[in-house]
Interface confidence: medium
């Protein structure tokens, strides 16, 4: 599905096959400004959760060396946001003995803030991106990724963790967001919907895309994920929207073709190394950036989100495979695994390009309501 405004020169226009081509302490709100944990009832908006390297058993992330193997990152315990009470629940709850944060389900109790108080923070993710209100920031230069083109060996772990499909990444994938802001990629995972129902986490002017990829990074300033949680810029996520296109995306096919092997919750397989950057849009120069949070408990804030303007195209069959192959806990399909959008609460989303320029003939002068404070080269 594409909105009429999704043209090549407008924000989020022009898809990419992807083949060739990151606030201080937790700020808990008062009752009146608590972020909503669910969208108003609507068929597109069943919220879900995020998957990140775990808190329980976090290994040290050592400096890169040629001898190191893959990081063995366990899943972060997650809790799902309540869904629309009118909708059937897609997942049952999951228990992990002695671990409060792993007891979760779509819809109903427990409320997220009870599981992790940070989930009631003022600066949460995902958010709705409104390009017209984004602050054009020329200092946001093209993203640079290093070492994302992986050889077939060593193979990588692809896992159905019950709430997403996650690919654990080896050491050596580096990403830079600016001066002194260097990151190592840890893992990537996807969020999706169900048949005929989109499932991206972020939205653009209320429009939800079919799916979304997240590549999760740890700042090189921290040796462990648990040290970085809640620290400004401690974690950074690259996010891209997945859309339907006419052709099969060969990069994604390398993962999607293996989903049947991990249909059961908790199952995993090994896949050959691949070009991770090919899973992202080819245009690294046009993106939105804001500071938010993990999209599941512990909902730690200080996460730098970079959302690409360009989308990635997958075929209809591929999107169907993504949303219709995996199973979650309790004989339920793993679908609609996204959290509701959260209020900005005064945050400004920055854009690396003039996203607020309306291409329609009605706009004589582009209105830029917000300004960028970042420094350049």
């Amino acid at each position: 599905q594409r909105l009429p405004r999704m043209q090549e020169d407008s924000p989020l226009g022009g898809g990419s096959s992807g083949e060739d081509d990151p606030l201080g302490e937790e700020d808990l709100p008062s009752e009146e400004d608590s972020p909503r944990e669910e969208d108003p009832p609507g068929e597109e908006d069943l919220p879900g959760e995020e998957d990140l390297p775990g808190e329980e058993d976090l290994p040290e992330v050592k400096p890169k060396s040629e001898e190191e193997g893959s990081l063995k990152l366990e899943d972060l315990p997650t809790v799902e946001a309540p869904g629309d009470p009118q909708e059937p629940q897609n997942n049952a709850h999951r228990d992990k003995e002695g671990d409060d944060q792993s007891h979760w389900r779509y819809g109903g109790d427990p409320p997220w803030p009870r599981v992790s108080p940070a989930c009631a923070g003022r600066f949460q993710s995902p958010v709705d991106i409104r390009p017209q209100l984004a602050a054009f920031c020329p200092a946001l230069r093209p993203l640079e990724l290093l070492g994302f083109q992986l050889p077939p060996l060593p193979e990588l772990r692809l896992r159905n963790n019950g709430h997403s499909v996650q690919l654990t990444l080896p050491p050596g994938l580096e990403m830079a967001l600016g001066p002194g802001r260097e990151y190592r990629a840890l893992q990537l995972h996807l969020h999706w919907g169900a048949a005929g129902r989109p499932g991206s986490e972020h939205t653009v002017e209320g429009h939800r895309f079919p799916a979304e990829i997240h590549v999760v990074h740890l700042s090189t300033a921290f040796a462990r994920v648990d040290e970085a949680l809640g620290r400004p810029g401690g974690l950074a996520v690259l996010a891209a929207f997945l859309e339907e296109g006419p052709e099969e995306n060969s990069a994604y096919e390398q993962l999607l073709s293996r989903l049947e092997e991990i249909a059961e919750e908790g199952s995993e397989t090994q896949v050959p190394g691949l070009d991770i950057s090919a899973l992202l849009p080819s245009d690294f120069s046009r993106y939105f950036q804001y500071e938010g949070s993990l999209t599941t408990p512990p909902c730690a804030q200080g996460v730098i989100w970079t959302v690409f303007n360009q989308t990635v195209m997958l075929s209809a069959k591929q999107l169907h495979t993504l949303s219709d192959t995996l199973w979650g806990p309790g004989d339920s399909r793993l679908q609609l695994n996204f959290r509701a959008t959260q209020p900005l609460n005064g945050r400004v989303i920055e854009a690396s390009f003039p996203a607020g320029v309306d291409s329609s003939p009605r706009a004589a002068e582009p209105v830029q309501l917000n300004s960028c404070l970042a420094a350049g080269d």
Partner: antibody, heavy 119, light 107 residues
């Protein structure tokens, strides 16, 4: 004004050692990725070693791995390259370079220090 | 390792004319390419990064284009100070590699 000044080069016999230094000024050194690049006569520029802003990530060219060690002292605004077991093929002009605002392309280079390995 | 091949090795151009320098990567490097200028006895100077972005202070006559495996540096109207060697470099994957260079000389 950004300045990078290399020192420590010279003539050394095969198997010998040298320690190159790069003194940086005019910018917040601790924010920047830094590299050593060499240029031998009639040969291509070659990235020898790189180090991220906090020193936690290092890279070495395969042919120097185990022989060269890159390090930095952010308190002293200095970058170093300890070169051991030097070979004739290490003869080159060695440049210290700063990476553009933490990224991977190099925006400032020193004037270089010459290393000659010969018996 | 990714091999960067520059052509031509030497380009003879008259001042005021346009110069087009080519750089081909042996595999896809997306847009992770930089262009440098080096004059005799001097260190390299960054002109272009991310394939098409002019670095701060670089004159508008220098432009970069391309993605994937084929890249071009164009100097729209050569000035006397532009006669030098030009190198492309990929920084998509280690080892970062440079092209062999194109020497732009006065015709």
């Amino acid at each position: 004004e950004v300045r990078l000044v290399e020192s420590g080069g010279g003539l050394v016999k095969p198997g010998g050692s040298l320690r190159l230094s790069c003194a940086a000024s005019g910018f917040t050194f601790s924010n920047y990725y830094m590299s050593w690049i060499r240029q031998a006569p009639e040969k291509r520029l070659e990235l020898v070693s790189a180090i991220n802003s906090d020193g936690g990530i290092t890279y070495y060219l395969d042919t120097v791995k185990g022989r060269f060690t890159i390090s930095r002292d952010n308190a002293k605004n200095s970058l170093y390259l300890q070169m051991n077991s030097l070979r004739a093929e290490d003869t080159a002009l060695f440049y210290c370079a700063r990476h553009r605002s933490g990224y991977f392309s190099m925006d400032y280079w020193g004037q270089g220090t010459s290393v000659t390995v010969s018996s | 390792e990714i091999v960067m091949t520059q052509s031509p090795a030497t380009l003879s151009v008259s001042p005021g004319e346009r110069a087009t320098l080519s750089c081909k990567a042996s595999q896809n490097v997306v847009s992770a390419v930089a262009w440098y200028q080096q004059k005799p006895g001097q260190s390299p100077r960054l002109l272009i990064y991310s394939a098409s972005n002019r670095y701060t202070g670089i004159p508008a006559r220098f432009s970069g284009s391309g993605s994937g495996t084929e890249f071009t540096l164009t100097i729209s109207s050569l000035q006397s100070e532009d006669f030098a060697a030009y190198y492309c470099q990929q920084y998509r994957n280690y080892p970062w590699t440079f092209g062999g260079g194109t020497k732009v000389e006065i015709k």
